[in-house]
């Protein structure tokens, strides 16, 4: 599932409230009705708008994946916040999942930085002072490096 | 799920034309206001135009005022995009959008978008 999908609402609950629309939009925390009249709160915890808008379903929220924290809760205005969990990362290039970090450098080098949720361990030559990309772990570690569980993308939109 | 599927780009010289389309597969674009966006080489995305599907509303950059022209088909769920007098400066990939999201109502310019087309490459050379 990702924050782009849409979140389908035949129907106004009571607890949605209406009002209308500004120059043809409608405020964060809403969505416009089909005839564009009337602006329909999102439904809390369920999805969610991040801007003046004129979309005709909220966003469905974010549900953290196994594997990941969850920062901060979906709300009307802003999605889900997930984060991997302790020992494990997310790439730019592979948002979509979290990868455990590796547990050492390679032999030859020393760690300079440490496993944070965005990062794997960081390595460099010890004479040379050049980083390492941090495919291959030393020959005398057995360091798993099975991707984990798939993550759902996170608060940004757009 | 809202999918955008742009077509008609391709090459044109200094003074051409050319016409985008952009057809939303599936039961909808998934809001009323649809727009085009571009980005040149090595820039950022920036705004091109954008239409109000329920009555015809047409907004525009100011660097494509008077060339460009935004219009809708309802019952083909597509929209276009007439470029004329075309200049080297509008080569870029146009991509179409949907869900535009703006800062504050009154803005003109939206600021970015919720669903996105793959994007159509449009070169204006000689």
């Known amino acids: 599932i990702t924050q782009q999908d849409l979140a389908p609402q035949q129907r106004v609950a009571p607890q949605q409230k209406r009002s209308s629309p500004s120059e043809g939009l409608c405020p964060p925390g809403h969505h416009i009705s089909e005839d564009g009249r009337d602006c329909i709160s999102c439904k809390y915890g369920q999805d969610y708008s991040t801007h003046w808008n004129d979309l005709l379903f909220c966003l469905r929220c974010t549900r953290c994946d196994s594997g990941e924290v969850e920062l901060s809760p979906c709300t009307t205005t802003r999605n889900t916040v997930c984060q991997c969990e302790e020992g494990t990362f997310r790439e730019e290039d592979s948002p979509e999942m979290c990868r455990k970090c590796r547990t050492g450098c390679p032999r030859g080098m020393v760690k300079v930085g440490d496993c944070t949720p965005w990062s794997d361990i960081e390595c460099v030559h010890k004479e040379s002072g050049t980083k390492h990309s941090g495919e291959a772990p030393a020959v005398e570690e057995t360091v798993t490096s099975s991707p984990g569980t798939p993550a759902s993308p996170c608060s940004l939109s757009g | 799920e809202v999918q955008l599927l742009e077509s008609g780009g391709g090459l044109v010289q200094p003074g051409g034309s050319l016409r985008l389309s952009c057809a939303a597969s599936?039961?909808?674009?998934?809001?009323?206001?649809v727009g085009w966006f571009r980005q040149a080489p090595g820039k950022g995305r920036e705004f091109v135009s954008a239409?109000?599907?329920?009555?015809?509303?047409?907004y525009y950059a100011d660097s494509v005022k008077g060339r460009f022209t935004i219009s809708r088909d309802n019952s083909k769920n597509t929209v276009y995009l007439q470029m004329n007098s075309l200049r080297p400066e509008d080569t870029a990939v146009y991509y179409c959008?949907?869900?535009?999201?703006?800062?504050?109502?009154?803005?003109?310019?939206?600021?970015?978008?919720?669903?996105w087309g793959q994007g159509t490459l449009v070169t204006v050379s000689s």
């Open positions: 959008a949907a869900g535009l999201q703006y800062n504050r109502a009154a803005d003109r310019v939206p600021v970015g978008a919720v669903y």
């Open positions: 599936g039961r909808t674009f998934g809001s009323i206001r």
């Open positions: 239409i109000n599907r329920n009555d015809g509303t047409t």
